[in-house]
Amino acid sequence: ARNGDHCPLGPGRCCRLHTVRASLEDLGWADWVLSPREVQVTMCIGACPSQFRAANMHAQIKTSLHRLKPDTVPAPCCVPASYNPMVLIQKTDTGVSLQTYDDLLAKDCHCI
Amino acid sequence: ARNGDHCPLGPGRCCRLHTVRASLEDLGWADWVLSPREVQVTMCIGACPSQFRAANMHAQIKTSLHRLKPDTVPAPCCVPASYNPMVLIQKTDTGVSLQTYDDLLAKDCHCI
């Protein structure tokens, strides 16, 4: 149940996909990855106001309880709903190989 | 890749399963749910310090980039890794029915 996509906080303030440029050094991968030298990391960033992109019933409950008990129950959080695969060329004990990672780059986002 | 379960912030401070007691009124369900009158809502609450219960490679990247760019990239967030099903007795147009919800109660938690 993907709820409202209208952000009440203003354009671009709510949970959505962002791209962050990162080097192998930034990611702590320089000792085991050869390529790429830089990654366009897609990640989910932004606020999750009431029912905005609620992933499921749990997210709706969380919103309700956060409104009642904000010090106890956090607001829903902006996280990946799905991922895009990515390949890395990496060093291994047996040499260089290509490895596909399915859980590295966010494809789209929701609140949970 | 479920990383370290040791919480560096002290016992109970990191991402884990919490139970919050909530009435139908609290949840905004009073007009369509008959039973239960109260729900023991299990949800994921707590901090996600470096590599604590990292759900996947994306969570590890997020940790690295949060350390570098804390104002741009948020820390990973404590969310359900899986759910426990729950039944609700609910009012419908044709009377009362039993409905199972698979995405209502968190079963265990991870950081993403």
Epitope: S35, P36, P85, M86, V87 | -
Partner: antibody, heavy 118, light 112 residues
Framework: QVTLKESGPALVKPTQTLTLTCTFS??????????VGWIRQPPGKGLEWLAH???????YYNTALKSRLTISKDTSKNQVVLTMTNMDPVDTATYYC??????????WGQGTTLTVSS | DIVMTQTPLSLSVTPGQPASISCRSS???????????LYWYLQKPGQSPQLLIY???NLVSGVPDRFSSSGSGTDFTLKISRVEAEDVGVYYC?????????FGQGTKLEIK
Amino acid sequence: QVTLKESGPALVKPTQTLTLTCTFSGFSLSTYGIGVGWIRQPPGKGLEWLAHIWWNDNKYYNTALKSRLTISKDTSKNQVVLTMTNMDPVDTATYYCARLAYDYVDSWGQGTTLTVSS
Amino acid sequence: DIVMTQTPLSLSVTPGQPASISCRSSKSLLHSEGITYLYWYLQKPGQSPQLLIYQMSNLVSGVPDRFSSSGSGTDFTLKISRVEAEDVGVYYCAQNLELPPTFGQGTKLEIK
């Protein structure tokens, strides 16, 4: 297991247009970092890079042949198509497609042999 | 385009003996980030080329460790410590510092 297979005519006449298809399996051309390239090898000679296409639809053409080449992909069919116009006998060669991952060219097709002759 | 020049163009080696192939580029292949964009391929008789060496000195997984590669910015050497019958074919050096990627003219290795 990664496999690539080139298909196309064995013979074309001068001035005609060549269409080659690379059909692949074992990887997806929607994966970040992945591309498919075309390379040719005239009989008894070395390798020449023609063109490549990336997961994000960025394309590269060898400058010397750019006006004659078009590369495209159909991700759902796992195919990459190269067209080459105004064929000439000097274009007689074995044409290979290959999988790229950034600068890592690790899997090649078996090649398709083309003769340009009237 | 960067020109790659190989020597010798053919080589006949007794099994168990070492072999060495040289490659020279018309421009330094050492990038400012410290990577040398030089590659070695082997095309066995009747087959398509296979990658042996990645970024000058990294052996590809599955390639026997009797193969090694070294060099500077413009002068490179592929060495086979003990030639075996399965090593016959045409060896190509290639560069990928600049587009288009370009190949040497090839060195044919035969067994005596």
